[in-house]
């Protein structure tokens, strides 16, 4: 790497993937193994993130970008940049601080993550329950008995639950 010639800051010309090495007269040196610099002009390279334990590598570290992790099967990411992994549960369950627990009666969860949510209250829309809810599935609302005229067979699916979001207790 050639010596930078900037009169102001000789380090400003060091590109991403290098660092300005004070020990070598401010020459741009390549980042050592397992480190990176994502911007130019850096005086040090950052240590690469290591995806260990319940984390697995989604993208390898390079000299210009950090590694990215996701979670091993049976777990899913939590927090910014997959900072933690939390376990999946079965449909019909939710994760609590003590582990996976079945949804209480009157609630459901159709995913492996997220929380148990109340069944749709069909009567609020003036409808009747066409298919009962379970721990894994919401109720299916149908027209109210008064609406059932010959030839009418429309079934209204329940309003979608709030955004699955990723989680509570």
């Amino acid at each position: 790497f050639e010596r930078t010639r900037s009169l102001q800051d000789p380090c400003s010309n060091c590109p991403a993937g290098t660092f300005c090495d004070n020990n070598r007269n401010q020459i741009c040196s390549p980042c050592p193994p397992n480190s990176f610099s994502s911007a130019g002009g850096q005086r040090t390279c950052d240590i690469c993130r290591q995806c260990k334990g319940v984390f697995r590598t989604r993208k390898e570290c390079s000299s210009t970008s950090n590694a990215e992790c996701d979670c091993t099967p049976g777990f899913h990411c939590l927090g910014a940049g997959c900072s933690m992994c939390e376990q999946d549960c079965k449909q019909g369950q939710e994760l609590t601080k003590k582990g996976c627990k079945d949804c209480c009666f009157g609630t459901f969860n159709d995913q492996k993550r997220g929380i148990c949510r109340p069944w749709t209250n069909c009567s609020l829309d003036g409808k009747s329950v066409l298919v009962n809810g379970t721990k894994e599935r919401d109720v299916v609302c149908g027209p109210s008995p008064a609406d059932l005229s010959p030839g009418a067979s429309s079934v209204t699916p329940p309003a979608p639950a709030r955004e699955p979001g990723h989680s509570p207790q």
């Epitope: 933690m84 939710e94 207790q169």
Partner: antibody
């Protein structure tokens, strides 16, 4: 980006009341238990209270039982702590914290100082 | 008096390994997960270990957690000056229906 911003702290006389607020953003507030944790000057962390996603269950630490009330307004993404009959020993920095499903506090507010003194 | 018991202080020299203990009972550590937090002066606590031994990303693998029975411990190897902080253990307590913290351990790097 998850943000928790406490407000409402200040100086109050013994026996007085104060209501703390915590404005939350960057996540689906109604999906999470939320907590208050406090720290007296030079002392350790003390859990005060937490509240279930829909507000239907509330739990209190010994120091808060009977005097403090935790509540939330999911439409405003805000957590509250109503503190009554305040004592000098309630002087502390009060932190609002988001409780992850796995039971941990990963996101904390910056804290608001409550001083109880005459 | 904290429900979880930690030594008030611990110390070590750079490069050393130090261990901080946390003792509880069957209703907290014995039946629930343990969490460890690091707190630097004037800042909010930072999660260090969750679910007994899991590290969030960004926490160096010099930090490790373990649990046995009604006790837990946090080990810090290759001690560095920036590790000087207060460390707290925490767990849910089934009897109290609440979170309990240890009294905290002030770690000094000599």
């Amino acid at each position: 980006e998850v943000q928790l911003l406490e407000s409402g702290g200040g100086l109050v006389q013994p026996g007085g009341s104060l209501r703390l607020s915590c404005a939350a953003s960057g996540f689906t507030f109604s999906d999470y238990y939320m907590s208050w944790v406090r720290q007296a000057p030079g002392k350790g962390l003390e859990w005060v209270a937490n509240i279930k996603q829909d507000g239907s269950e509330k739990y209190y630490g010994d120091s808060a039982t009977g005097r403090f009330t935790i509540s939330r307004d999911n439409s405003k993404n805000t957590l509250y702590l109503q503190m009554n009959s305040l004592r000098a020993e309630d002087t502390a920095v009060y932190y609002c914290a988001k409780e992850e499903r796995i039971g941990t506090y990963y996101y904390w507010g910056q804290g608001t100082l409550v001083t109880v003194s005459s | 008096q904290s429900v979880l018991t930690q030594p008030p202080s611990a110390s070590g020299t750079p490069g050393q390994r130090v261990t901080i203990s946390c003792s509880g009972s069957s209703s907290n550590i014995g039946s629930n997960y343990v969490y460890w937090y690091q707190q630097l002066p004037g800042t909010a606590p930072k999660l260090l270990i969750y679910r007994n031994n899991q590290r969030p990303s960004g926490v160096p693998d010099r930090f490790s957690g373990s649990k046995s029975g009604t006790s837990a411990s946090l080990a810090i190897s290759g001690l560095r000056s920036e590790d000087e902080a207060d460390y707290y253990c925490a767990a849910w307590d089934d009897s109290l229906s609440g979170w309990v913290f240890g009294g905290g351990t002030k770690l000094t790097v000599l």
